[in-house]
């Protein structure tokens, strides 16, 4: 999906009002020095591409993020503020239902959510390309 035509300000507002707090809750008890951010993004559409990938694509050691509250709210924000996003996600959602697993918070998941927080920071304030 091409995130170029999303309403970035509305997505930012959704993130700051609720999603950010859900991420903090998920990370509670984790030391702030524990993880280095290794995933970066250069502009807002790129940031959303990386955020979508980390939030919804299962990875080795962390298959459960898509069912977390922050993920569901992220999905809702993208569906509302990115034209045509919902349609592109129907097949992906059906595939995800088939592989649903019970929620387990692993260290790998915590690291992934730390990466997400970093990507959202850059989405909220792109360093070189203020949009």
């Amino acid at each position: 999906y091409d995130f170029t035509n999303c309403d970035f300000e509305k997505i930012k507002a959704a993130y700051l009002s609720t999603i950010s707090k859900d991420l903090i809750t998920y990370m509670s008890g984790t030391k702030s020095t524990e993880f280095n951010n290794t995933v970066s993004c250069s502009n807002r559409p790129h940031c959303l591409t990386e955020i979508q990938s980390l939030t919804f694509n299962p990875t080795a050691g962390c298959a459960s993020l898509a069912k977390e509250m922050f993920a569901m709210k992220t999905k809702a924000a993208l569906a509302i503020w990115c034209p045509g996003y919902s349609e592109t996600q129907i097949n992906a959602t059906q595939a995800m239902k088939k592989r649903r697993k019970r929620k387990v918070t692993t260290n790998k998941c915590l690291e992934q959510v730390s990466q997400l927080q970093g990507l959202w920071r850059r989405f909220n304030r792109p360093l070189l390309k203020q949009q």
Partner: antibody, heavy 119, light 107 residues
Framework: EVQLVQSGAEVKKPGSSVKVSCKAS????????IEWVRQAPGQGLEWMGV????????NYNENFKGRVTITADKSTSTAYMELSSLRSEDTAVYYC????????????WGQGTTVTVSS | DIVMTQSPDSLAVSLGERATINCKAS??????VTWYQQKPGQSPKLLIY???NHYTGVPDRFSGSGSGTDFTLTISSLQAEDVAVYYC?????????FGQGTKLEIK
Amino acid sequence: EVQLVQSGAEVKKPGSSVKVSCKASGGTFSNYLIEWVRQAPGQGLEWMGVIDPGVGDTNYNENFKGRVTITADKSTSTAYMELSSLRSEDTAVYYCAREDNTGTAFDYWGQGTTVTVSS
Amino acid sequence: DIVMTQSPDSLAVSLGERATINCKASQSVSSDVTWYQQKPGQSPKLLIYYVSNHYTGVPDRFSGSGSGTDFTLTISSLQAEDVAVYYCQQHHRFPLTFGQGTKLEIK
């Protein structure tokens, strides 16, 4: 607890340069932007520039006409701000600050470094 | 550059009374406004981010509102420790810019 500790006060001659350091502790240095802000005596706050220590990207206030250079050393968790071609109007307290967890504000500030430019 | 203009420049309010500080941007900054408090001889402290969100540990008597070009910081019941200079800041466009500051004193 995150802390930003800045280098000590400096007295400089007009036309010279000054390099102020800002050492971070208590957080992951490369994960957060570091900003530089200055405050002339009895005046308000002026944003100078920012660096992403993770990748080295920077953005500067063009009002400083290329006189500002911001760098970061990940190995020592230290950011630096160098200001060249100093003039008396550059006499100020220089602060480093770290972006907050949302990327929308500066939540931790250094104690400030006083730079006096005088002949 | 986006100019942030605060009013008034100084303000004297009685203890327990409401204090209101205004900040006007020269062009729309959406909701990208932050408020800082600076006491004499100290570094600035973050109060409110993204117009109305309280930073951790900031008392509820502080609140922010507005959008677009007009923003307000309100202290609902002034306490002695609130004496300080207050700054608004926009981070909507580079360069980031601050208001000139509003000095709050006790009447």
